[in-house]
Amino acid sequence: QAVPPYASENQTCRDQEKEYYEPQHRICCSRCPPGTYVSAKCSRIRDTVCATCAENSYNEHWNYLTICQLCRPCDPVMGLEEIAPCTSKRKTQCRCQPGMFCAAWALECTHCELLSDCPPGTEAELKDEVGKGNNHCVPCKAGHFQNTSSPSARCQPHTRCENQGLVEAAPGTAQSDTTCKNPLEPLPPEMSGTMLM
């Protein structure tokens, strides 16, 4: 089996990930592994020479680049935070800060914005990936309520008065909890929406 550099008449190489076609000499040469770059190009008699990326730079793929890419920090002004550091083999991993979603993509997220509030009676639909899109507010399901304007508040189940030895004074709605009262006491009108003991 031929070892790079080797002649290639059809301009293709056996291992597309780790080799590349060099048209000047019509040969297949080795790519440099992630974390390295080409410090000396190949020739007919000598394969590619690779060198380690300098600190604060990286190359993620097998490559025939003559430089490494500069590590970039996650920009907090754009609402981004770091989840994994840049290394010689991988760029910095960023995500939207809590309470934000990605508003601009260019291969990766470049700008995050605040999530919209969900009004009382609704909650944000749960997404597979946090920060991927703005809130889509959905109504609380039957037997649940949510009484604030918030990007993250979840609908809670209505209180079951009988579990507390109380009786229902007013039924719960999507925006308010059940009102319970002591079975022996009448409910004053101004106490609506509270629990009496």
Epitope: T52, A54, A84, P85, S88, K89
Partner: antibody
Framework: EVQLVESGGGLVQPGGSLRLSCAAS????????MSWVRQAPGKCLEWVSG????????NYADSVKGRFTISRDNSKNTLYLQMNSLRAEDTAVYYC??????????????WGQGTMVTVSS | DIVMTQSPDSLAVSLGERATINCKSS????????????LTWYQQKPGQPPKLLIY???TRESGVPDRFSGSGSGTDFTLTISSLQAEDVAVYYC?????????FGCGTKVEIK
């Protein structure tokens, strides 16, 4: 030949201090991150601390933060671990390990033989 | 921190037979941009330091016999010794290097049956 040789281990009382050294040879020391990894008797491997090739970035396991300090002298091809306020649970074999990267977050491709640290009264 | 869980704790296999070791990470260690899993396997013989066997979950370190192979992606990984030799008796560890701090599994001891 690529080689890492640790030294400085020994018996120390709780609350005491120790400084470990790791002498590197056979590779361009300043190009690669280094770490300390420890192994208590019969226990798992635990990453303790890492330092980037230039020494500009350091990180520590929560269990040693504020007590241990990692450093390197690239002119001497030597890695250090200053261990203060030692506890019984720090008793372990301490290995120095090279990353195939300027950052310590990588596979450890070369390991030293280790130096034993025993914390006991 | 990403927790690495290995199974079984120990394994007894006849010479020439296959040994299979599993490693599960509490979080995904696959980096989608380059489709690499940031996971390694080490071999540690008694009284010796660990030795790198496999990186990126499936790439053998140079000089490692081809009876050792790594597979898996995301959160579930396997180290296979296709035909166990006497010199393979050791403890095997997986390690993730996807995020700080790098974390290890607690090891699987491989013995001869």
């Amino acid at each position: 030949e690529v080689q890492l040789v640790e030294s400085g281990g020994g018996l120390v009382q709780p609350g005491g201090s120790l400084r470990l050294s790791c002498a590197a040879s056979g590779f361009t020391f300043s190009s690669y991150a280094m770490s300390w990894v420890r192994q208590a008797p019969g226990k798992c491997l635990e990453w303790v601390s890492g330092i980037s090739g230039s020494g500009g970035r350091t990180n520590y396991a929560d269990s040693v933060k504020g007590r241990f300090t990692i450093s390197r002298d690239n002119s001497k091809n030597t890695l250090y671990l200053q261990m203060n306020s030692l506890r019984a649970e720090d008793t372990a074999v301490y290995y120095c390990a090279k990353s195939d990267n300027w950052h310590y977050l990588d596979a450890f491709d070369i390991w030293g033989q280790g130096t034993m640290v025993t914390v006991s009264s | 921190d990403i927790v690495m869980t290995q199974s079984p704790d120990s394994l007894a296999v006849s010479l020439g037979e296959r040994a299979t070791i599993n490693c599960k990470s509490s979080q995904n260690v696959l980096y989608s941009s380059n489709n690499k899993n940031y996971l390694t396997w080490y071999q540690q013989k008694p009284g010796q330091p660990p030795k790198l066997l496999i990186y990126w979950a499936s790439t053998r370190e140079s000089g490692v016999p081809d009876r050792f192979s790594g597979s898996g992606s995301g959160t579930d990984f396997t180290l296979t010794i296709s035909s166990l030799q006497a010199e393979d008796v050791a403890v095997y560890y997986c390690q993730q290097y996807f995020n700080t701090p790098p974390t290890f599994g607690c090891g699987t001891k491989v013995e001869i049956k």
